[in-house]
Amino acid sequence: TLNSVLNSNAIKNLPPPLGGAAGHPGSAVSAAPGILYPGGNKYQTIDNYQPYPCAEDEECGTDEYCASPTRGGDAGVQICLACRKRRKRCMRHAMCCPGNYCKNGICVSSDQNHFRGEIEETITESFGNDHSTLDGYSRRTTLSSKMYHTKGQEGSVCLRSSDCASGLCCARHFWSKICKPVLKEGQVCTKHRRKGSHGLEIFQRCYCGEGLSCRIQKDHHQASNSSRLHTCQRH
């Protein structure tokens, strides 16, 4: 499994010169092992390509989404997978390639005429003023810069945190995702026992703000495991 990789962000088995520079013999930094796909074939590496372990779509490339590589696979083992092209099956928008969105389980074109009617009722000021990314790739959230002019405010529907205004993140709320405030010092946060477990949350909290981390509240150390309260605390 990828558990060891999911629990460690170390990058290893790098080609020289990055793998271990002179003076740092122990600096070789371990990539994900081969992933088993349906049919049992090991993940084939191309140019030493190693799948990237992830917990959220936003951690992946612009043309990828985060999911378990096997149908019905362990929810804790997720990697970035290639996005689905038009007319392919999908379960959420992020699974579809840029320029498409998920409608009735199928990736369809998100050109202005299709998309505006579909989600206009539920989105208010949801997306940023320019949806071309800095690196020149169109994002999966691209709708049209003419359609939406401000970053999503609190409560706006979103696909990823970059769709939300500063101080907000994109988090699950029932079966959609909305912009919610990034957590402040002292606020209750969710500490996931294993990566990927937040996929089960219906009401997802944002992450802790800059300089804060989600830790057990000091006076809750004695409490039972299940009732331990985590709050955002200074590093």
Partner: nanobody, 129 residues
Framework: KVQLVESGGGLVQAGDSLTLSCTAS????????MGWFPQAPGKEREFVAA????????HYADYVKGRFAISRDNAKNTVLLQMSSLKPEDTAVYYC??????????????????????WGQGTQVTVSS
């Protein structure tokens, strides 16, 4: 004009701590990964730490894990590298760099120098024994 400016370098004793700062201007870098790459005299520039566009993900070379910590503040367009328990072999010019979010990502993306489009001028860190 896009610029990355490093600061915070200096001369310290082995075992000391130092925090390097990198400030970006001319563009917002929230859709970029930011990394630190030291280069010792006569050696290749190497990867030590990176933080992705998704704030939760940090990546480190094994030899600095537990000693170095990278963080970013997108509102201020700043990336910090907190270095502790410094060793003489950490002596190098430390470069800050920015890599765009790619179409496809692999495990080695953050550690590969050629993926980084923008580079600072570097800040010298010298650790004496």
């Amino acid at each position: 004009k896009v610029q990355l400016v490093e600061s915070g370098g200096g001369l310290v004793q082995a075992g000391d701590s130092l925090t390097l700062s990198c400030t970006a201007s001319g563009r917002t870098f929230d859709n970029y990964a930011m990394g630190w790459f030291p280069q010792a005299p006569g050696k290749e520039r190497e990867f030590v730490a990176a933080i992705s566009w998704s704030l939760s993900r940090t990546h480190y070379a094994d030899y600095v894990k537990g000693r170095f910590a990278i963080s970013r503040d997108n509102a201020k367009n700043t990336v910090l590298l907190q270095m502790s328990s410094l060793k003489p072999e950490d002596t190098a010019v430390y470069y800050c760099a920015a890599a765009p979010r790619p179409k496809r990502i692999s495990v080695s993306y953050f550690s590969t120098t050629s993926n980084y489009d923008y580079w600072g001028q570097g800040t010298q860190v010298t650790v004496s024994s």
